[in-house]
Every structure is written in C-alpha cells, then in structure tokens.
C-alpha cells in the first residue's frame, strides 16, 4: 500500500534548496545522531515480568541493513515465584520507523523508503475477557 | 554503507555500498499490514507497568506527529490494583530512523535522523546493590 | 472516496452522559490522528482534543479535560467521544475530523457532517 | 492561549470585487489556517499552512501573512464566496480558531 506523499510547496523554499527532479527527494542517508546510545536499564528483557528474546533480520537491499526484532518468551507473564502466570498475558510493544529500500530493475537502481513495525519488548497486561452468553 | 549484491552481467563500474545521498520516490511504501485489529492501543491502560502517551509535533519532521511514552508509576500494579514497590516500571526505548528537512523549511530535501524514543513500560525485577 | 460519517442528533438530559461516534472510511484510519471541534453562536469553534488510534494516545484541551474522553476502535475504524455530566453549556454541533500524523502542515483536511447536542429538562 | 482575532467581523462585497479579511494573532505563530462554512455545513479545510489552496479552491483565493498578521484576498468576488471564514493556529496549545468573518454578496 501506499501512502501520501512527502513533501509539498508550502514552504518559502530558501534559495540554498537543492534542485529536486519532481517526483523524487533528495535524501541523505548520513544519520544525524548516529551515535547516540540507548541508555535503557541493563537487562530489562531478561528481568521483565514479560521477558523477550532479540533476533536480528539482515537486508543487504535495506539501511540500515541490521534491524532487531524482539519476541515476548511467554504467553503468560513471571510472577514472583519465577513461574509462568497465564491469568495474564505477555504483549509486544510495536514502534515505526524508516528503512531504505534498495530496488534493482535490471542494471538500474531505485530507492524507496519504507515505513516498517519493530516489535521493541514486551509488557505485562491484565487480559481481556469476553463473556460468552 | 552496506554492500550490495549486483547483478553479474551489469557494469562493473556500480558501486557497491549505499550511496551518502540517494534520490528517493516521494511516495513512502507501507510495509506494515498497519491495520493488524491484534495490534491493541490499550495496551497502556491495561499494562502492570502502564503509562500516559505524549503528544510531541515537529513540522521539520517527518513523521511529524509521535506519541511518547512515560511511565504512571515508579512501582508496578498487582493484583490488588495497588502500586508495589518491590518492583519497577522501567521505560522500553527504541532507537527509530526519520527524516530531518535539510536545509530547514525545503521541502523535498531530507536527511535520516535517528531518534530515541520511549515505546511503552514494562515491569522488571530491580536489581539490588548490597552495600558492604 | 475520504469520509468521517458521525452519529446523529442527541436530545440528551442534564446530568446525564452521551458517546458521540465518527466512522471513518476511504482512508488508512491509524495514518491520521481523529481531533474533535465543538461549534457554538456564543464561542464560535473550539478544539476539544486529539485521539491517535494507533497508539491510542489522547490530548485535551484544559477546558474539555474531564468533561470529554476520546476513545478509538481500530477494527471498526470508529473514533467515539464521551461527553460527561451534561449541562446546558455543552449543547452544540461536535465534529470530528482527521489529521495527517505523518505531514502535518495538512492540517485537518477533512470533517465529519457534526452531531447536534442539546441539552435539556 | 493565542487568541485570533479576525476581522472584519461582517462584510458584504460586489461581484468582482477584490476581498481582503485578516487574522491577527495575540502571539507569534508559525502558520495560518483557513476554513470556510457555509450555513449548515460543516467547515472546510481551505487555505492550508498559510500559502496553499486546498483541493479544490479557486485559485482567486489566496493567503499570506507572518508573526502575528496574516490574511486571506479574493481577487475577484463571485457569489459562490458567500460564507463564513475561520482562521485557525496550531503552533500552540490548546489550538485556537478565530471568532469568523461573515462575507455576504451585494
């Protein structure tokens, strides 16, 4: 599916644009803050009440190239006695970001952006119950 | 840059890795079957570790609009509906891509910027410094 | 074709609450945050707040904070408003509209047909 | 919160005639929006991120301004103009409207 195009005319277009053929952008792909570390707690999949594993899917045709993917370990979720807990359920929490997409057409190259899902961790939630009549 | 597999009958002359700058469709592929009805937006309110969302715009931006996460509770929620302290709501960031206008206010010309954004809250065991 | 299809009128008793509904359709519903406008003779239009379906995310204005809680079902691509504690003050025309989460310079580029609220003994 | 103040409040034009209303913003703000209502109806989106012409709109209208000031100009008045215009700002919470100008055809 598509979505609507970025951008538009309304601003006062500076003279310092750069000339765009229509259609397209002009997207530089040097990352701004490329960095910058995630300063998370230590751990947090292992010592979560909804733990996660990480794996990492790898596109040579996509940048970046490497994107962690993460899955809850359980339905259910830890309680205290470190035992599963299926009265409540293990969810993943789901963020967007872009990817460039690297197209070859023959001898060709295009590029596209890409909105994709991360599934970044996972949280404990109370279920939801739906009574039968 | 990443290198890229080519096809072996194409010029040699093409290179290999990601260009710094790329001229991109201005129409953005949905890669996301986004209207998934299992992916919950309540999850927030029903989370041991909920939190409130926050709304942060930037024109500049694209996206524009994102929607940040903070934690309700130092504690976690049991199931009395009471905050424990024994455990903790911890905050589950994610680093994210999106494009920066460049130069300000053009408005086909972007770069990547990446982004630290808080996602959502989860509920961890704390770990406990003994001091000797 | 876009369309927000809103409920329709409500003749509604002080003290009592009403959930106004805008089905969306023609669009992706969670590429665009749902924001609700009240019209009135005496205060002309003002905005109450914004739901993101998506993240389910909301934002009020101070004013509605408590008096209005927006809500959306992304399965059925409806956003709701609950309006609470009627008063004679919150008769008006609601509307529901969308905005572009993505490119927000559109702003709210397309409106429900709006539900009149009275309020009345 | 940013007041907008649009005037005139009431005004009537002849056909063909040139139509300027304003937005006077009680605050700085980074662009205007405009919708036109006509009885019954709801608003429509019409003048976008101060500049642009929604889908739609006939390029007579146009949109200028900056800061504080802002305007929308008929270049030339037809009858199907007839209607009422907000100015509306979104670079503060809680987004404001203005109170509308009523533009009538003589």
């Known amino acids: 599916r598509k979505i609507p195009k970025v951008g538009h005319t309304f601003f006062q277009k500076p003279e310092s644009c750069p000339p765009v053929p229509g259609g397209s952008m002009k997207l530089d792909i040097g990352i701004i803050n490329e960095n910058q570390r995630v300063s998370m707690s230590r751990n947090i999949e292992s010592r979560s009440t909804s733990p996660w594993n990480y794996t990492v899917t790898w596109d040579p045709n996509r940048y970046p190239s490497e994107v962690v993917q993460a899955q809850c370990r359980n339905l259910g979720c830890i309680n205290a006695q470190g035992k599963e807990d299926i009265s409540m359920n293990s969810v993943p929490i789901q963020q967007e970001t872009l990817v460039v997409r690297r197209k070859h057409q023959g001898c060709s190259v295009s590029f596209q952006l890409e909105k994709v899902l991360v599934t970044v961790g996972c949280t404990c939630v109370t279920p939801v119950i739906h009574h039968v009549q | 840059g990443i290198t890229i597999p080519r096809n072996p009958g194409c010029p040699n002359s093409e290179d290999k890795n990601f260009p710094r700058t790329v001229m991109v469709n201005l129409n953005i592929h949905n890669r996301n079957t986004n209207t998934n009805p299992k992916r919950s937006s309540d999850y927030y309110n029903r989370s041991t570790s909920p939190w409130n969302l926050h709304r942060n715009e930037d024109p500049e931006r694209y996206p524009s609009v994102i929607w940040e996460a903070k934690c309700r509770h130092l504690g976690c929620i049991n199931a009395d509906g009471n905050v424990d302290y024994h455990m903790n709501s911890v905050p589950i960031q994610q680093e994210i891509l999106v494009l920066r206008r460049e130069p300000p206010h053009c408005p086909n010309s972007f770069r990547l910027e990446k982004i630290l954004v808080s996602v959502g809250c989860t509920c961890v065991t704390p770990i406990v410094h003994h001091v000797a | 074709q876009v369309q927000l299809q809103q409920s329709g009128a409500e003749l509604v008793r002080p003290g009592t609450s009403v959930t106004l509904s805008c089905k969306a359709s023609?669009?992706?519903?969670?590429?665009?945050?749902i924001h609700w406008v009240k019209q009135t003779p005496v205060h002309g239009l003002e905005w109450i707040g914004v739901?993101?379906?998506?993240?389910?995310?909301?934002f009020y204005n101070q004013k509605f904070d408590g008096k209005a809680e927006l809500t959306a079902d992304k399965s059925s691509s409806t956003a709701y408003m609950e309006l609470r504690s009627l008063t004679s003050e919150d008769s008006g025309v609601y509307y529901c509209?969308?905005?572009?989460?993505?490119?927000?310079?559109?702003?709210?580029?397309?409106w429900g047909q709006g539900t009149s609220i009275t309020v009345s003994s | 919160q940013i007041v907008l103040t649009q005037s005139p409040a009431i005004m009537s034009a002849s056909p063909g005639e040139k139509v300027t209303m304003t937005c006077s913003a009680s605050s700085s703000i980074s662009y205007i929006y405009w919708f036109q209502q006509k009885p019954g109806t709801s608003p429509k989106r019409w003048i976008y991120?101060?500049?642009e012409l929604a889908s739609g709109v006939p390029a007579r209208f146009s949109g200028s301004g900056s800061g504080t000031s802002y305007s929308l100009t008929i270049s030339s008045m037809e009858a199907e103009d007839a209607a009422t215009y907000y100015c509306h700002q979104r670079s503060s919470y809680p987004w404001t409207f203005g109170g509308g100008s009523k533009l009538e055809i003589k």
């Open positions: 509209t969308r905005y572009y989460r993505y490119e927000s310079f559109y702003g709210m580029d397309y």
């Open positions: 023609g669009y992706i519903f969670t590429d665009y945050e």
């Open positions: 739901n993101d379906p998506e993240s389910g995310g909301t």
């Open positions: 991120a101060t500049f």
